[in-house]
């Protein structure tokens, strides 16, 4: 069970530095091609990793201007890296029910990263929430 | 166990750069985030930025932007942040800090005096 | 950038003593609050993640509350060793701020 829940750990403190990135990449909204994305909000209990797909799958890009335009696309790369795979994750992508990313709002960058920090910080909460007391290493 | 090891104190001319070394020991390196935070004699705690050990990508506080650099040598388990044009005002002692949910482990500090 | 307003900045109490520290966001902060000890030459140390998780190794006299924007760090019994400088600092938003200090002194 702990090296499971150390694994859960690992793969949470990942999610918590995707919320830096994604606040990196706010101070650069400008900087973003003004493009609407598909961008999940209130998303429902056990789609959250299928939501948090439809976020990497994005097509968020940088305009191209200024001298911003390496910091953007490093962190956007880093938004799409593949997370390591969990139990939770597995057992999500069996459902079916969730709604396709298409079906999602879709939303102007700025909108975009604020919907993609909430959900990141909801995993992160539930992840936290339904876990015993100690620490990341305990 | 986790630990940080820092470099010693330095002192350094109005002008001049310094670069504190922080060595990390007892988990993954580039599992974890580091944060570096200083502190001015008897002032409150002030971030300075993050880099993640794997691949180098930084974020740096609006406050220090321009004149400091996060780099690692991940064949030492070894972060280091530089900071240029130093002023009196950076007299401080700097902290590294790995991050997981909150900055759960630091190194002693290093105290960098800034003085002609 | 999000102001964290600690209070009190200093206090006096005795061994056994139930002590309070609060710190104040100025905005929601979704519990990524964090509290740290700081004593003189030595290293700081996380007490408390996420508005209320015990740090591994941290005793059970400490604990922390709130939501919001108010969270609140009690130390139950006061022991000799807890007479230092208390930090809280928020991971909601970059960049990470902390709050002033609080330091609880010898009455």
């Known amino acids: 069970h702990k090296s499971s829940s150390q694994g859960q750990d690992r793969h949470m403190i990942r999610m918590r530095q995707l919320i830096d990135i994604v606040d990196q990449l706010k101070n650069y909204v400008n900087d973003l091609v003004p493009e609407f994305l598909p961008a999940p909000e209130d998303v429902e209990t056990n789609c959250e990793w299928s939501a948090f797909s439809c976020f990497q799958k994005a097509q968020l890009k940088s305009a191209n201007t200024g001298n911003n335009e390496r910091i953007i696309n490093v962190s956007i790369k880093k938004l799409k890296r593949k997370p390591p795979s969990t139990n939770a994750g597995r057992r999500q992508k069996h459902r079916l029910t969730c709604p396709s990313c298409d079906s999602y709002e879709k939303k102007p960058p700025k909108e975009f990263l604020e919907r993609f920090k909430s959900l990141l910080q909801k995993m992160i909460h539930q992840h936290l929430s339904s876990r015993t007391h100690g620490s990341e290493d305990s | 166990q986790v630990q940080l090891v820092q470099s010693g104190a330095e002192v350094k001319k109005p002008g001049a750069s310094v670069k504190v070394s922080c060595k990390a020991s007892?988990?993954?390196?580039?599992?974890?985030?580091m944060h570096w935070v200083r502190q001015a004699p008897g002032q409150g705690l002030e971030w300075m930025g993050t880099?993640?050990?794997?691949?180098?990508?930084?974020i740096y506080s609006q406050n220090f932007k321009g004149r400091v650099t996060m780099t690692r040598d991940t064949s030492t388990s070894t972060v280091y942040m530089e900071l240029s044009s130093l002023r009196s005002e950076d007299t401080a002692v700097y902290y590294c800090?790995?991050?997981?949910?909150?900055?759960?482990?630091w190194g002693q500090g290093t105290l960098v005096t800034v003085s002609s | 950038d999000i102001q964290l307003t600690q209070s009190p900045s200093s206090l006096s109490a005795s061994v056994g003593d139930r002590v309070t520290i609060t710190c104040r966001a100025s905005?929601?902060?979704?519990?990524?609050l964090n509290w740290y000890q700081q004593k003189p030459g030595k290293a700081v140390k996380l007490l408390i993640y996420?508005?209320?998780r015990l740090h591994s190794g941290v005793p059970s006299r400490f604990s922390g509350s709130g939501s919001g924007t108010d969270y609140t760090l009690t130390i139950s019994s006061l022991q000799p060793e807890d007479f230092a400088t208390y930090f809280c600092?928020?991971?909601?938003?970059?960049?990470?701020?902390f709050g002033g200090g609080t330091k609880v002194e010898i009455k």
């Open positions: 905005q929601d902060i979704s519990n990524f």
């Open positions: 007892g988990y993954t390196f580039t599992d974890y985030w």
């Open positions: 600092q928020q991971g909601h938003t970059l960049p990470r701020t």
């Open positions: 880099i993640d050990p794997s691949d180098q990508y930084t």
């Open positions: 800090a790995r991050y997981g949910f909150a900055m759960d482990y």
């Open positions: 996420y508005t209320s």
